[in-house]
């Protein structure tokens, strides 16, 4: 009992004057609180609290549930307590079966005893299973059994409080421990798409997935460089113990150009934070941008293949693509495909495959593409390189020898004279006249060149060679001359094609 110092308020005194009292079930509990300023008795056990304004607390027939702490308080707020055990062999434990523990913290299994004199007060696993090896506990007959430093592995552990009574083990009702996990890593965040491209007025919706061990993870969508609170919709799931998933969906029902920017999904817990971003670009209307993958002026040798390749950005999706030549649309020989299978891809490739091109197939090849908003086109000028072909080689009435050759690039015509029967014509003869003629064929076709020399310059028998050549190859034609007296005759001309 407390000692009294004169002039200072003292705690009340309780009779019987001991800290613990043991009574048998059915016996009377009589507690007297002596204090001039008595206010109340309070009884506490587990979550239950009762009050009594009488200074004498009387329970005529004590029950096990009357076990607990009886506290007398005076008007100065000073108090004194006695703990009463109501010994009941049929009810050794008072229990509150709710059992929650925070990971790494201690938690109390609330199974106070009604008889402090029983032995081996401890915890046991259900159905004879052993407790985890690392589980440590401290028994307290008045409060229960404290489990030290709760582990995540103890989650859903089934337990009994246990005592030995007269040599036999007695178990309480079962407890199932629920462990509230501690955060030991940052949340895992991911976003449905890393970038979005929209037209004005379209709906922007993006979902952030947050994964963590519990639902107390914090998450939010933020706009970079803005404090405005964004409207989010949540869904969440408990995928088993310590596996919580939340989906935070951000929606702008009618996006505007000035909504463009970077949006961040941010999540944090007591361990740390994580974030992921998505980029929104809102355009006032769709677009198509075409990028040729080869030069738009193409030179190709006769009989060879060439691929005309474009990449293009199209938003929204391209709806019509075609390749055109000479007002004719290709139905085959071309393919069009997305640059990547990514859902947000806006880049595409189109390839026209031209095979074994003829000299007559040069010209403008046009790629056209359109979507719901715009059309776009790109033209390729294809030139087919052809070896010169000698179209005519004649002796004109005025005594001129004339050679006409066609090819691409423009052929050059050289003249040579071979005296007598020599096979090699090396002495060059300067032409009198050289002209490039307009071709009657399409543009990008062969170029025609006409060259003439004066045959009167030749005084001896021999052969005149007209040689037409360009980057691709060369072709020759020959005029044979024989003198009969003073007369010169042209013997049949012939050509010799030289690769």
């Amino acid at each position: 009992q407390p000692s009294v110092s004169p002039g200072e308020p003292s705690p009340p005194s309780i009779h019987p004057g001991k800290s613990d009292l043991i009574v048998r079930v059915g016996d009377e509990i009589r507690l007297l609180c002596t204090d001039p300023g008595f206010v109340k008795w309070t009884f506490e056990i587990l979550d239950e609290t009762n009050e009594n304004k009488q200074n004498e607390w009387i329970t005529e027939k004590a029950e096990a549930t009357n076990t607990g702490k009886y506290t007398c308080t005076n008007k100065h707020g000073l108090s004194n307590s006695i703990y009463v055990f109501v010994r009941d062999p049929a009810k050794l434990f008072l229990v509150d079966r709710s059992l929650y523990g925070k990971e790494d913290n201690d938690t109390l299994v609330r199974c106070p005893l009604t008889d402090p004199e029983v032995t081996n007060y401890s915890l046991k696993g259900c159905q004879g299973k052993p407790l985890p090896k690392d589980l440590r506990f401290i028994p307290d007959p008045k409060a229960g059994i404290m489990i030290k430093s709760v582990k995540r592995a103890y989650h859903r552990l089934c337990l009994h409080c246990s005592v030995d009574q007269e040599g036999k083990s007695v178990l309480s009702e079962k407890f199932i421990l629920k462990v509230r996990p501690a955060f030991k890593a940052v949340p895992v965040v991911s976003v449905s798409k890393a970038s979005y491209l929209l037209r004005e007025g379209e709906e922007f919706t993006v979902t952030c997935t947050i994964k963590d061990v519990s639902s107390s993870v914090y998450s939010t969508w933020k706009r970079e460089n803005s404090q405005t609170k964004l409207q989010e919709k949540y869904n969440s799931w408990h995928h088993g113990d310590f596996n919580y998933e939340r989906q935070a969906t951000l929606t702008i029902s009618s996006a505007r150009v000035n909504d463009s920017g970077v949006f961040m999904c941010y999540a944090n817990n007591t361990f740390g934070s994580a974030n992921v971003t998505t980029t929104l670009e809102v355009v006032d209307k769709g677009f198509i941008n075409i990028f040729p993958m080869i030069n738009t002026t193409v030179f190709v040798n006769d009989g060879e293949n060439v691929d005309l390749i474009v990449e293009y950005e199209a938003f929204p999706k391209p709806e019509h693509q075609q390749w055109i030549y000479m007002n004719r649309t290709f139905t085959d020989k071309w393919e069009d495909y997305p640059k990547s299978e990514n859902e947000s891809n806006i880049r595409y490739v189109s390839e026209l495959h031209l095979t074994r091109l003829k000299g007559t197939e040069g010209g403008t090849y046009t790629f056209l593409v359109s979507n719901s908003d715009v059309n776009a086109a790109i033209a390729f000028n294809v030139y087919v390189n052809t070896k010169p072909e000698i179209l005519t080689y004649d002796r004109l009435v005025n005594g001129m020898l004339q050679c006409v050759a066609a090819g691409f690039p423009e052929p050059t015509i050289d003249w040579y004279f071979c005296p007598g029967t020599e096979q090699r014509c090396s002495a060059s003869v300067l032409p009198v006249d050289v002209q490039t003629l307009n071709s009657s064929g399409p543009p990008f076709g062969k170029l025609v060149v006409q060259s003439s020399i004066d045959s009167s310059a030749f005084k001896h028998n021999g052969t005149v060679e007209c040689k037409a050549y360009n980057d691709v190859g060369k072709t020759s034609a020959y005029f044979n001359f024989a003198f009969k007296g003073n007369n010169k005759e042209q013997i049949h001309p012939h050509t010799l094609f030289t690769p």
């Epitope: 929650y100 509230r180 519990s214 639902s215 408990h238 939340r246």
Partner: antibody, heavy 119, light 107 residues
């Protein structure tokens, strides 16, 4: 003793506003997610809204999204529900309920407060 | 949203009867299923959580079973104080949803 006590209910006209409070005692309030659940006269239970222990995240049923706002003041151990643009179909007893162990299991309920929306 | 369907919506039984109430989810909810009891004019009271775990203070005549989409609440021997309305609730995902209720009346 663990307890929840709602207040703030009453009669309100359609389009009007009301703020419900729920005073918590007997447990560490900030450790628990809290909820509002309602029950229209003669009908079943309908979850309305939830808020995490820190107050950082809030969740709503589609039927009240944009009109109701859940909040909490952990220093006062109090949960709130601000109800705007009230409709006749919001007439119900509103209960606050504690979520135990992170799992949206409502282990402690208040006694409820009646909200009547009528002209 | 996950729909919860309870059956029957009401039943009449006598004291001592064994009573079974079923609850079906529109998609799998694993074992995230809870049962509540509500008496007229009172707040609901948690009976069973995680499909089969008995809440502290709830008599052992109440039991729960099931997983996935089909769940059962059983009262092994009906007592006078058990006449009430019983609700199932899924806590697998938000939005949280309740069954329509089963009213247990005295025959």
């Amino acid at each position: 003793e663990v307890q929840l006590l709602e207040s703030g209910g009453g009669l309100v006209q359609p389009g009007g506003s009301l703020r419900l409070s729920c005073a918590a005692s007997g447990f560490t309030f900030s450790d628990y997610s809290m909820n509002w659940v309602r029950q229209a006269p003669g009908k079943g239970l309908e979850w309305v809204s939830a808020i995490t222990g820190s107050g950082g995240n809030t969740f709503y049923a589609d039927s009240v999204k944009g009109r109701f706002t859940i909040s909490r003041d952990n220093s006062k151990n109090t949960l709130y529900l601000q109800m705007n643009s009230l409709r006749a179909e919001d007439t119900a007893v509103y209960y606050c309920a504690r979520s135990n162990y992170e799992q949206d299991v409502f282990d402690i309920w208040g006694q409820g407060t009646l909200v009547t929306v009528s002209s | 949203d996950i729909q919860m369907t309870q059956s029957p919506s009401s039943l009449s039984a006598s004291v001592g009867d064994r009573v079974t109430i079923t609850c079906r989810a529109s998609q799998t909810i694993y074992r995230y299923l809870n049962w509540y009891q509500q008496k007229p004019g009172k707040a609901p009271k948690l009976l069973i959580y995680d499909a089969s775990d008995l809440q502290s203070g709830v008599p052992s005549r109440f039991s729960g079973s099931g997983s996935g989409t089909d769940f059962t609440l059983t009262i092994s021997s009906l007592q006078p104080e058990d006449f009430a309305t019983y609700y199932c609730q899924q806590s697998y995902s938000i939005p949280i949803t309740f069954g329509g209720g089963t009213k247990v009346e005295i025959k």
